[in-house]
């Protein structure tokens, strides 16, 4: 079949496309292009009869086109009127026409596109940006970057107008970053020149450093006050509310009591207009004072926070001491001091870091005492727990859930039911139940504090009939005379029997088996090696019974005192000596021997083959339990006789 | 070895009441639940509820709510059931039933069944 | 209540034939349990818990299935196989049985 491909599809303004044809029938007359879909004189291009090999222009010819023996066209230094249809018309040698249509599309080469803005200068938390990519092109695409990565995905920014306008509402002074435009359409893609916003922002509240607001009479008042702003700050000093200089430092030499007071910085922005002051109190002492404490935290959240608890005043060449629950501090990698012991700090709290913290600052004649602080340590919710913990009821009774989480402040609780929420209350209760309330019943504990939330599932079963018993063990391997195992008969179900019974009989009465629990757990005590038996558990109601597969305990003992076998001390020169050693235990002991107090091989035979009287002594074998961590030996004496 | 050996048969006049009994042995009915079952003329089983001897406890099918009453007596190892109201459709075999405690199996012991008639 | 549909009402088997029994609930359940009842006797546990043999019963006998559907299956019948097989569920009141099914000799 006749097909016209183009090559390129798109095509820039200037640039030449090639009509190019494939197929083409043999035996032909001549053919013309047409400009549009369908043949039509008023619009031929050009036709072209192969005999004569001559080209003839049509009405729509423009003097840019060529066309090529193989009938494909090409169309040079293209323009934007170029864009559409081309309609190639077959003639061949027996007159029978044949017909092909192909396209393609003339895009722009786009300009460098640039940036404006209505707003050169925005002020934080106020103004919005409308940053516009210029100039306007149809059938382009806008793109734009921030610091040469793609747009965040934000509520602030906004894209309008096709792209072309990206708009930054509420800016804030992260939003100071290099901006970019790009235009794209499928001949070209250009990017602009970067713009940097500049956000006007501040005077954020003035820091004054130092920290330290306790002064000794005749020390030096330092003062420096520093504010977040764009364009920089405008600094003022007062004290107690009148005007002392328009400087970031404050310095006043050898201060005196009189000089305590408030010292307050006041930061000014000429651009946003806007002022924010800060206040500190400075306190000049002629004698040292009563210590009390300060805290960075005073609800610190457990596992999560630090807190720093400083001792003030804050004196030079001052001794500072410090007590927690009334004891020196204990030694702990939680617990740190600054180098002149000012500030205690806790690395990581816990719910047991409450305190009472205490500091003191030591003078020449005692130690003055601070009052007691007390930290609110915010902690949890631990892993919350459902009670009662049966997981197994009958229908008709009434199913009552308690949840109870370890949190400070204390959980808020909710329940779910298969997932779905029920109620936002500590305590679940279905009365009259049926096997529908069957399900996973999930206690979530909240602490709004901390803002953690955790969450325990409980798989609450409702049938008349129970399920077929297992049985959990707390010690799958307890060692002879040293542990106790204790057994539980899975689940726990209300109303219920619980029996047991030991290599298929009901529990023998022995002082060191126990039941508990409403007989739902067996316990032994101080296990023995025949106690390594088949244990069964069984559970009824009215209408079911059921036994559990049996589990056989593996009780780990020994090794008991070896044994030397053959029992023979004496033997002729020129025998054999043949020793084997054998030791109860489980699991297998390791064997070893001395000969002499001399290491022999770890084999539980020692062979020696014709013996001498050299051969003359004690033989030691020795077992080793590694399950136990248990040992045992025994010695023999072997004499050999000429 | 457990049997449970269960009153004779009763011919009973229609809006009357009857008492049937089952007397277990070889086990003590405390240590276990007394189940009631009946089996009309050519016809299915249907359970009619269980009484806990232990503690006077019992469950009962709405269709026989009114209608049967579990007691029983511990020093005689008996239990009774007790049908009231009765009309012909109340004629059937009544066995009682009960499931070991010592072992997996439940309404493994059956009495022999009484056949209680209602006449017009 | 808790229906059990036992199918077939009635079957015919050989000596030697396999035989199922099927008993579909309708709500499901967490177990089945079987029994066996000849004409003037009291009903006799044949399978409890779904698959479990009870005391005495031949291993020809097996059960099984999970939720509604469950089935009772003998592998090879005998004679002494001849009698009606009732369903029954025990997960909620009131406890229910199938209608039965008659198995007959041919």
């Known amino acids: 079949k006749l097909t016209i491909e183009s090559t390129p599809f798109n095509v820039a303004e200037g640039k030449e496309v090639l009509l190019l044809v494939h197929n083409l029938p043999q035996h032909l007359f001549g053919y013309s292009w047409y400009k549009g879909e369908r043949v039509d004189g008023n619009r031929q291009i050009i036709g072209y009869v192969i005999g004569t090999q001559q080209a003839t222009p049509g009405p729509a010819y423009s003097g840019r086109e060529i066309i090529y023996p193989n009938a494909s066209l090409l169309i040079q230094n293209i323009i934007q009127n170029d864009t559409g249809f081309y309609t190639l018309h077959v003639i061949k040698s027996d007159l029978v026409n044949e017909e092909a249509t192909g396209q393609f599309r003339v895009y722009p080469e786009l300009p460098k596109p640039s940036i404006s803005s209505n707003n050169s200068k925005p002020v934080e938390d106020k103004d919005a940006v409308a940053f516009t990519c210029e100039p306007e092109t149809q059938d382009a695409t806008y793109l734009w970057w921030v610091n040469n990565q793609s747009l965040p995905v934000s509520p602030r920014l906004q894209l309008s107008n096709g792209n072309r306008t990206l708009t930054l509402f509420n800016v804030t002074r992260n939003d100071t970053a290099s901006y970019k435009c790009e235009t794209q359409n499928p001949v070209s893609a250009r990017r602009s020149d970067s713009v940097i916003l500049n956000v006007l922002y501040g005077p954020d509240a003035p820091t004054i450093s130092p920290l330290n607001t306790s002064y000794r009479s005749g020390e030096n008042l330092n003062l420096s006050c520093h504010a977040a702003s764009n364009p920089p700050a405008q600094y003022s000093w007062f004290v107690n509310g009148t005007f002392q200089q328009s400087t970031q430092e404050l310095f006043i030499p050898n201060i005196t009591v009189n000089n305590s007071g408030s010292y307050t910085c006041q930061a000014h922005n000429s651009d946003t207009g806007l002022n924010r002051t800060t206040v500190t109190t400075i306190t000049v002492y002629a004698e040292p004072p009563k210590p009390f404490i300060t805290s960075n935290n005073s609800n610190p959240v457990e596992d999560e926070d630090a807190v720093a608890l400083t001792c003030e005043p804050e004196i030079q060449n001052t001794t500072y001491l410090w007590w927690v629950n009334n004891q020196s501090l204990p030694v702990s990698p939680r617990l740190q001091l600054s180098n002149d012991n000012r500030t205690l700090t806790l690395l990581s709290v816990t719910r047991n870091d409450v305190g009472p913290y205490e500091c003191g600052i030591q003078n020449e004649l005692s130690v003055d005492h601070s009052d007691p602080v007390i930290l609110n340590v915010l902690y949890g919710p631990d892993d919350p727990t459902i009670s009662p913990s049966y997981t197994y009821y009958r229908p008709g009774v009434n199913l009552s859930l308690s949840c109870h989480a370890a949190s400070n402040p204390p959980a808020q609780y909710s329940w779910l039911i298969d997932g779905n929420i029920q109620q936002h209350t500590q305590e679940l209760f279905i009365s009259n139940i049926t096997e529908k309330n069957s399900g996973l019943y999930t206690c979530q504990a909240n602490n709004s504090a901390s803002g953690h939330s955790r969450t325990t599932v409980k798989t609450i079963t409702v049938s008349a009939e129970l399920p077929k018993p297992s049985i959990s063990s707390n010690n799958s391997k307890p060692v002879e005379d040293k542990d106790a195992v204790a057994f539980t008969c899975e689940p726990e179900a209300q109303n219920t029997t619980y029996l047991w019974w030991v290599n298929g009989q009901s529990l023998p009465v022995s002082p060191r088996l126990q039941l508990s629990n409403g007989n739902r757990t067996l316990t032994l005590f101080n296990v023995t090696r025949n106690d390594a038996r088949a244990y069964v558990c069984g559970i009824q109601n009215s209408v079911s019974a059921n036994r559990s597969d049996p589990v056989t305990l593996d009780v780990l003992y020994g090794p008991d005192t070896p044994i030397i076998s053959p029992p023979d001390s004496s033997y002729l020169s020129g025998a054999n000596l043949n020793l084997s050693c054998h030791s109860a235990s489980n699991p297998s002991p390791q064997y070893s021997w001395r000969i002499n107090g001399i290491p022999q091989q770890h084999t539980q035979v020692l062979f020696i083959a014709k013996i001498t009287p050299n051969n003359n002594g004690t033989y030691a074998c020795f077992v080793s339990n590694l399950a136990t961590g248990r040992n045992n030996s025994i010695v023999k004496s072997i004499t050999v006789s000429a | 070895q457990v049997q449970l050996q269960q009153s004779g048969a009763e011919l009973v006049k229609s809006g009357g009441s009857v008492k049937l009994s089952c007397t277990a042995s070889g086990f003590n009915i405390k240590d276990s639940y007394m189940h009631w079952v009946r089996q009309g003329p050519e016809q299915g089983l249907e359970w009619i509820g269980w009484i806990d001897p232990e503690n006077g406890d019992t469950e009962y099918a709405p269709k026989f709510q009114g209608k049967a009453t579990f007691t029983t007596d511990t020093s005689s190892n008996t239990a009774y059931l007790q049908l009231s109201s009765l009309t012909s459709e109340d004629t059937a075999v009544y066995y009682c039933?009960?499931?070991?405690?010592?072992?997996?199996?439940?309404?493994?012991?059956w009495g022999q069944g009484t056949t209680v008639t209602v006449s017009s | 209540e808790n229906v059990l549909t036992q199918s077939p009402a009635i079957v015919s088997a050989s000596p030697g034939e396999k035989v199922t029994i099927t008993c579909s609930a309708s709500?499901?359940?967490?177990?089945m349990h079987w029994f066996q009842q000849k004409p003037g006797t009291s009903p006799k546990l044949v399978i409890y818990?779904?698959?479990n043999l009870a005391s005495g019963v031949p291993a020809r006998f097996s059960g099984s299935g999970s939720g509604t559907s469950y089935s009772l299956t003998i592998s090879r019948m005998e004679a002494e196989d001849a009698a009606t097989y009732y369903c029954q569920q025990r997960s909620s009141y009131p406890l229910t049985f199938g209608a039965g099914t008659k198995l007959e000799l041919k």
């Open positions: 039933n009960e499931g070991t405690p010592d072992g997996p199996y439940y309404f493994d012991y």
């Open positions: 709500s499901s359940v967490s177990a």
């Open positions: 818990s779904t698959s």
